[in-house]
């Protein structure tokens, strides 16, 4: 990281340091501690107070984003004294440089794309680097497929997603021969910024008086069981007149996906396309392709 | 219409074991997620352990760790649970139940169920 | 000993609607994890009636609803009819091992 860390201390200092690879911070252990607390102060004045680790002379932060610059601080308490110590990280370059409107999605159900633009006060030629973590193993994923602009980097593919977990830490940084780029991070959810694609093997079967519509639940990235899905089908009559409204119809996932409605012979030509969500967030796909049944002169 | 299709009754002595199968018809056991719950009248439910998707892997209840084993046998659509080192207040009604919500942990369908008694 | 809370019994006439309780924790419904509802019929396996706090799989009527409210949940059956006496069992998910936790169930009596 570029980012310059200043230390604000008393004299007998406790040397606090953090390292934003394993967002650990640490500070050198003292004889007879009888407590010890850590935090981070944000710029909107949120504490965010991590488990100590078992040696209490460091403590890591799970799920914080640092580009807005944040400020550690140490208490610890022996039995002969008390040191505090602050430790700021700020986003050190020039302000404005950093990458924005970042935005990642995933969908196939295993590529993902991450988009970003060049900061307004970047110079022309600003590169900018992105670097994924995921929550468990803390293993950095390099952007394998930069998308350029002018040679400068604007995004991301990636087409394994194996290294990625329910939650993952996204960093932006920035180089530059002229001046300091600042980075910009943020946290995203996996379920959030999947994009499903639309149900698949879509079938219509009628008889005399019904007609049933059966489909399969997506292939998707997070694993996903059949009542997490929530589904949109829209059975459309053709050639009704322009502002004829379409029947949507909701249902829930089920292990048999199927949708059986009443439809008598003779029947007009329909059509019925599907789509598919993440039940908790209905996010919804495009439409699977249309389907007809019926007949013209129904 | 998916069903789940448990081995019958067993009868066994404190020490032992017992392996009892739940086989899945009208789907594919590749596709679902398989969870293991037993039930007494003194404890009610306890849940034992499943296929966790998530992980990848099959995970146990804390107090059964070491006793018991769940596997899969996806070619013929069966899932397996052995309990070892049997004791009395192990009788009870065994299910094997097909997960319907991943993130959201809900059993949509259940097999009837499998009694072990364990009795000296 | 059950981690959710259930009365152990509730009973209603037929046509009467009759609302059964459950309470969990911080670890579980209040997390906040989502909440499940079972029906178990004498002598048979459990039937999911309710999922995510309160939907319906397809085939269970609209007779029966549920909410859920900071660490509590509860479900709701009105119109009772003579074949809803049965036993009655919530479930969620907590961050403690073990993972998936039930109630101890509760004895609907149709009078």
């Known amino acids: 990281e570029k980012s310059d860390l200043r230390t604000v201390a008393p004299a007998s200092s406790l040397n606090v340091r953090f390292d934003s690879r394993t967002m650990n911070l640490s500070w050198d252990c003292q004889e007879n501690t009888t407590f010890s607390k850590c935090f981070l102060t944000d710029k909107k004045n949120r504490v965010v107070e991590p488990r100590l680790s078992n040696n209490e002379c460091s403590c890591t932060f799970r799920e914080i984003c640092l580009h807005e610059g944040v400020t550690f601080e140490v208490h610890v308490n022996t039995s002969q004294r008390g040191f505090q110590q602050k430790l700021l990280y700020p986003n050190s370059g020039r302000e404005g440089t950093a990458a924005q409107n970042f935005s990642c999605f995933i969908y196939n159900a295993d590529l993902m794309n991450c988009t970003w633009a060049r900061g307004p006060t970047a110079p022309r030629d600003v590169q900018y680097f992105l670097y994924i973590r995921n929550s468990k193993r803390r293993r950095e994923i390099r952007c394998p497929y930069y998308i350029q602009d002018s040679g400068t980097h604007v995004g991301c593919h990636l087409d394994n997603l194996s290294g990625l977990t329910s939650r993952n830490y996204f960093l932006v940084n920035g180089t530059s021969r002229e001046i300091g780029i600042q980075f910009f991070d943020s946290l995203l959810d996996t379920k959030k910024i999947e994009r499903f694609n639309p149900p698949s093997n879509v079938t219509v079967r009628c008889n005399t008086t019904h007609c049933l519509v059966r489909w399969k639940q997506p292939r998707t990235y997070q694993k996903l069981s059949y009542l997490d899905f929530q589904y949109q089908l829209d059975v459309h009559r053709k050639n009704t007149q322009p502002g004829t409204e379409n029947l949507l119809i909701n249902v829930s996932g089920d292990l048999e996906n199927r949708y059986n409605f009443p439809s008598s012979e003779p029947r007009a030509k329909h059509s019925v396309k599907i789509r598919a969500a993440d039940v908790r967030i209905l996010n919804w796909s495009s439409w699977s392709e249309a389907i007809e049944f019926g007949s013209d002169d129904g | 219409q998916v069903q789940l299709v448990q081995s019958g009754a067993e009868v066994k002595k404190p020490g032992a074991s017992v392996k009892v199968s739940c086989k899945i018809s009208g789907h594919s056991l590749s596709e679902l997620s398989i969870h293991w719950v037993r039930q007494t009248p003194t404890k009610g439910f306890e849940w034992m352990g499943g296929f966790d998707p998530e992980e990848n892997e099959i995970v146990y209840a804390q107090r059964f760790q070491g006793r018991v084993t769940m596997t899969e046998d996806t070619s013929i659509d069966t899932a397996y649970l052995t309990l070892s080192s049997l004791r009395s207040d192990d009788t009870a009604v065994y299910y094997c139940a097909i997960v319907g919500s991943v993130s959201r942990i809900t059993y949509g369908f259940w097999g009837k169920g499998t009694m072990v008694t364990v009795s000296s | 000993q059950a981690v959710l809370t259930q009365p152990s019994s509730v009973s209603g006439a037929p046509g009467q609607r009759v609302t059964i309780s459950c309470t969990g924790s911080?670890?579980?419904?209040?997390?906040?994890?989502?909440v499940s509802w079972y029906q178990q019929l004498p002598g048979t396996a459990p039937k999911l009636l309710i999922y995510?706090?309160?939907k319906r799989p397809s085939g269970v009527p609209d007779r029966f609803s549920a909410s859920k409210s900071g660490t509590s949940a509860s479900l709701a059956i009105t119109g009772l009819q003579a074949d809803d006496e049965a036993d009655y069992y919530c479930q969620s998910y907590d961050s403690r091992n073990p993972h998936v936790i039930f109630g101890g169930g509760t004895k609907l009596t149709v009078l």
């Open positions: 911080g670890s579980n419904i209040g997390a906040p994890y989502d």
């Open positions: 995510h706090n309160n």
